[in-house]
Amino acid sequence: NWVNVISDLKKIEDLIQSMHIDATLYTESDVHPSCKVTAMKCFLLELQVISLESGDASIHDTVENLIILANNSLSSNGNVTESGCKECEELEEKNIKEFLQSFVHIVQMFINTS
């Protein structure tokens, strides 16, 4: 599932490049392992912002698929309460390219620990 999430992120990156979306997004670029589920939640919520701002059907479908995949991969630990983690709004705002790069990085963390 996580490998499919990465290919969806690459697809979103390709689709966005032709659209010139200027949004800045809350981005966790240095994820601590004990906060990775919280960070994933922030990435997914921000991904929905991309979908809404783009108004693009392909981006919408890909984002929705990515959320479904991530949900199923995290169904066992998605409700784990991680303490001492940053709220989404406390994170640095970065451009879409940097956001997606950091997103791939956190997904790789999940791959390495699964």
């Epitope: 059907a57 392909s58 919408h60 984002v63 698929n65 998605g78």
Partner: antibody
Framework: EVRLMASGGGLVKPGGSLKLSCAAS????????MSWVRQTPEKRLEWVAT????????YYPDSVKGRFTISRDNAKNTLYLQMSSLRSEDTALYYC???????????????WGQGTSVTVSS | DVLMTQTPLSLPVSLGDQASISCRSS???????????LEWYLQKPGQSPKLLIY???NRFSGVPDRFSGSGSGTDFTLKISRVEAEDLGLYYC?????????FGGGTKLEIK
């Protein structure tokens, strides 16, 4: 008023195939993900398949995966369910349903068609 | 898979009474983004199912306010404050937080 008309049901032998259709009208079909849900003779409901708005992504439970294929033709406003290797337990009334977007709404099936009956028996 | 258990199987009521249907999931159906995709559907005799409630407590358009949904995590309830004749039928809960999406077994609301 949203309209969904399912058709294509019938009697088929175990191991046989059948293709169901669902004609959509009175809404912009390509703006919605769509699903198939079936109801057994005992009145239990079972989710069968979901397809994304553009048709690139499909989802199935294990009970039908590899045997059923959901597809759509947005130009024809039509949803399909190709069923193969049919079993007696696939006997049910099959409904098509429109899905509200997870991102902009509640991810619910807000409108359902009237259903088409599939009987698998020798 | 998430198992959805509905109780009771059958609920005999008098018109005007309050009715309460319970739905319990085998695991929490709060998704990673914090949403709980739990719906209630009503199937009247001879008809297709119709959406009543989505995301636990949101009433679908045109649904009377005598219907209300509540709950969180694994325990959910549908309440009908004053049962009318048109409310009779089969009620189903449904989770679509996690694939495979699953329905409860159904509750038949009938006249006592």
């Amino acid at each position: 008023e949203v309209r969904l008309m399912a058709s294509g049901g019938g009697l088929v032998k175990p191991g046989g195939s059948l293709k169901l259709s669902c004609a959509a009208s009175e809404f912009t079909f390509s703006n919605y993900a769509m699903s198939w849900v079936r109801q057994t003779p005992e009145k239990r409901l079972e989710w069968v398949a979901t397809i994304s708005r553009g048709g690139d992504y499909t989802y199935y439970p294990d009970s039908v995966k590899g045997r059923f294929t959901i597809s759509r033709d947005n130009a024809k406003n039509t949803l399909y369910l190709q069923m193969s290797s049919l079993r007696s337990e696939d006997t049910a009334l099959y409904y098509c349903a429109r899905r509200v977007s997870m991102i902009t709404g509640g991810w619910a099936m807000d409108y359902w068609g009237q259903g088409t009956s599939v009987t698998v028996s020798s | 898979d998430v198992l959805m258990t509905q109780t009771p199987l059958s609920l005999p009521v008098s018109l005007g009474d309050q009715a309460s249907i319970s739905c319990r999931s085998s695991q929490s159906i709060v998704d990673i983004t914090g949403n709980t995709y739990l719906e209630w559907y009503l199937q009247k005799p001879g008809q297709s199912p119709k959406l009543l409630i989505y995301k636990v407590f949101n009433r679908f358009s045109g649904v009377p306010d005598r219907f209300s949904g509540s709950g969180s995590g694994t325990d959910f309830t549908l309440k009908i404050s004053r049962v009318e004749a048109e409310d009779l039928g089969l009620y189903y809960c449904f989770q679509d937080s996690f694939v495979p999406y699953t329905f409860g077994g159904g509750t038949k609301l009938e006249i006592k």
